[in-house]
Structure formats: structure tokens, C-alpha cells
């Protein structure tokens, strides 16, 4: 018969022959022949291969270097790489997560719209009229101005995006 020019899925062409690829978690030891199947071996400890492959070497699991502020989010298996994340208060610089960035705080006049995670920074928003933030924080939202009326008081000093209103007693008119 004619030698194949293309092979089925999960096969590869070698020496005019279709051989089975090694399954994820295994590496190639020897190609198949007319008489033998492809020989594969499981990846060693701290190694992985995540696709059907003909690799002769497994990849090393990523090392989450604590010196860089990294820690293991998900331990690698023979079929998956280790996933790193950053220690509390920091987030990954990029998707590859090879280093960490300190979470940003929202300055006075701004509140936290979205708290930072291991992969994203704090998102801040300006405090709208009627709200304020007088601290630099990675957690605090804008707070509403105090309602003087509900306390039977009047506004003595108007609020800003950075300060609360100041309430005071009402001037009582004498008869």
C-alpha cells in the first residue's frame, strides 16, 4: 500500500508510518515501528506535558519563588503546570505571573470600586457629590455624607469629596 502522507488525530508521521502520540503526562521514549507501538513514559516528579505529544523531555513545573512574593495557587500535575499567584496585598504583574505588584490604594477623594485580587489591581473611582473618602485605602469605598437632618441638626460646613459635612445645632428663634 501507498505510505500515508497524513495521519489521524493523536498520531504523527515518521518514517512513512503513522505512530500514536504520547498522551498528556507522558513523554516519547521511542517511535513505533512496523511491529511495535510508540513507547511512552510518565513524566517525573515536578514535570509535566499538557498535550498529546512526541516530546522526548517533559517540561519542568513553574517555580513560585517566594523571594518574588509568589506562592502556589494550584500544584502542578503530570498533565498541568503549577499556577502561581502573589502573596496577600500584591497581584501578578502579568498573566505569566513571574513577579508581583503591590496593590494600589485609592487616594483621598477616591473610593474603591473593585478590590484587588491576586491577578488584578485595585480599581478606584472618584467620590461623587454626596460622598467622600478622607483616607488612602485599598479597601474603603466612598462614604455618604452624614445626614444632618436625620439627627435634627443643620449643615454648618459643606462636605467635599474628601471631607464629611459638619453638623451643628439649629439656631432656635426666641419668642
Amino acid at each position: 500500500p501507498e505510505p500515508p502522507t497524513a495521519c489521524r488525530e493523536k498520531q504523527y508521521l515518521i518514517n512513512s508510518q503513522c505512530c500514536s502520540l504520547c498522551q498528556p503526562g507522558q513523554k516519547l521514549v521511542s517511535d513505533c515501528t512496523e511491529f511495535t507501538e510508540t513507547e511512552c513514559l510518565p513524566c517525573g516528579e515536578s514535570e509535566f506535558l499538557d498535550t498529546w505529544n512526541r516530546e522526548t523531555h517533559c517540561h519542568q513545573h513553574k517555580y513560585c519563588d517566594p523571594n518574588l512574593g509568589l506562592r502556589v495557587q494550584q500544584k502542578g500535575t503530570s498533565e498541568t503546570d503549577t499556577i502561581c499567584t502573589c502573596e496577600e496585598g500584591w497581584h501578578c504583574t502579568s498573566e505569566a505571573c513571574e513577579s508581583c505588584v503591590l496593590h494600589r490604594s485609592c487616594s483621598p477623594g477616591f473610593g474603591v470600586k473593585q478590590i484587588a485580587t491576586g491577578v488584578s489591581d485595585t480599581i478606584c473611582e472618584p467620590c461623587p457629590v454626596g460622598f467622600f473618602s478622607n483616607v488612602s485605602s485599598a479597601f474603603e469605598k466612598c462614604h455618604p455624607w452624614t445626614s444632618c437632618e436625620t439627627k435634627d441638626l443643620v449643615v454648618q460646613q459643606a462636605g467635599t469629596n474628601k471631607t464629611d459635612v459638619v453638623c451643628g445645632p439649629q439656631d432656635r428663634l426666641r419668642a
Epitope: G69, E87, E88, S94, S99, L102
Partner: antibody, heavy 116, light 112 residues
């Protein structure tokens, strides 16, 4: 080998702008933030801010927020620091520094002189 | 902003003798994650700064073990067990607990 190579010295007039470059090599540019620190003559170190080349997201010291612009060009692995409305107090050596587990690599520094 | 205060500002030392530099922060640099975000840098004459110690007490790669860092949340010390001529320069402490990152004024170590 990680290297940060900065552009040459600049002499500028008050009120003008300066743009300093920092070319990175020897590592994946988008995996680390690039910070900028300055040092006035005979003075200490002052942090300006950083750029995250992965997201193009800058974070500034409030003191420089209105005058500094930090950018990064992924295609050339180069970070830039532009400072506008220059005044004599901006005369300093400007450094770029990579943040790994600290400022583990620094550029050689760029001297910016502001003089009329 | 967190204020970093170093002392002394000038430190003349005889080679072979120990040296100690103090750094105080206006706020505790101990994070709830257990790390203390205090760093020490040395700027030798005419050079860019270089890292000595990170996270208060960990020696950076390639730094001689005569250098050591210690401290609590707000009070920190850089010690050199036996000063050598190559140790001259300005030593800076820096906090990276929150933005803006801030440095101490620097301590100039010189040989007597």
C-alpha cells in the same frame, strides 16, 4: 544577563519637557514593572512611579501625577519617563529600576539639567 | 506618606570595625501576610544604587555575609560586622508597604 540602558544626558529650559528612555534586555519585559526614581544633586532618592508593561498601567507618586507620564513600548522592550513643565528643582539624575523581589536591577542613570 | 528616618547621617568607620545604621518608619512595615517590607540599598560613589537586603533581613544574591538586617515593625538596623574599604557610599532604607514608595535620607559611610 539583565541590562537596563538609559538615554544620554539632557539640558533643558524651564517650562519645557524631557523624555528619558530605558531599554531592557535579558528578561521578559512584560513580566516585571519598571519604576523611575530620581536623585537631585547631593540629595537622596525620590520615587516617581512605575509602569506595568504588560497592561500599560502606570502608578504615580501624587507629587508627580500632573507632570510625569510613564509609558512602555513592548515591541522594543523600552520604558519611557516624560516630565513636563520643567523647573530648576527637577535637575537630577533619573534612574529606571526593575522590580523583581526589590529594585534588583537599575539603569545607569540619566542626568537632566534644567537651566535658562 | 510613610516617613523614613535614618541615623546617623554620617558614619566614619575604621576598616575591620563593625558599623550599624538605624532606620525608623512612621508606620509599621509589617504586613498582615507576615512580611516586613523594608529594603536596604547601597549607592557607591558615582554608581547606581544596588540592593543589599530585602524584606528586612534577607541578604540579596552576591552580597557578602558581613551585612545583615534586622528590626521590628518600625525600627530597623543594618549591620556590617567588619567594614571594608569597598563598603564606602551612601546607604538608604526604603519602604514598599504602600505608595508612594519612600526612602530614608541616606547614611554616608566613610573610612577613617
Amino acid at each position: 544577563e539583565v541590562q537596563l540602558v538609559q538615554s544620554g544626558a539632557e539640558v533643558k529650559k524651564p517650562g519645557s519637557s524631557v523624555k528619558v528612555s530605558c531599554k531592557a534586555s535579558g528578561y521578559t519585559f512584560t513580566s516585571y514593572t519598571m519604576h523611575w526614581v530620581r536623585q537631585a544633586p547631593g540629595q537622596g532618592l525620590e520615587w516617581i512611579g512605575y509602569i506595568n508593561p504588560s497592561s500599560d498601567y502606570p502608578n504615580y507618586n501624587q507629587k508627580f501625577k500632573d507632570r510625569a507620564t510613564l509609558t512602555a513600548d513592548k515591541s522594543t522592550s523600552t520604558a519611557y519617563m516624560e516630565l513636563s513643565s520643567l523647573r530648576s528643582e527637577d535637575t537630577a539624575v533619573y534612574y529606571c529600576a526593575r522590580w523583581g523581589y526589590s529594585f534588583d536591577y537599575w539603569g545607569q542613570g540619566t542626568t537632566v539639567t534644567v537651566s535658562s | 506618606d510613610i516617613v523614613m528616618t535614618q541615623s546617623p547621617l554620617s558614619l566614619p568607620v575604621t576598616p575591620g570595625e563593625p558599623a550599624s545604621i538605624s532606620c525608623r518608619s512612621s508606620k509599621s512595615l509589617l504586613h498582615s501576610n507576615g512580611n516586613t517590607y523594608l529594603y536596604w540599598y547601597l549607592q557607591k560613589p558615582g554608581q547606581s544604587p544596588q540592593l543589599l537586603i530585602y524584606r528586612m533581613s534577607t541578604l540579596a544574591s552576591g552580597v557578602p555575609d558581613r551585612f545583615s538586617g534586622s528590626g521590628s515593625g518600625t525600627d530597623f538596623t543594618l549591620k556590617i560586622s567588619r567594614v571594608e574599604a569597598e563598603d564606602v557610599g551612601v546607604y538608604y532604607c526604603m519602604q514598599h508597604l504602600e505608595y508612594p514608595l519612600t526612602f530614608g535620607q541616606g547614611t554616608k559611610l566613610e573610612i577613617k
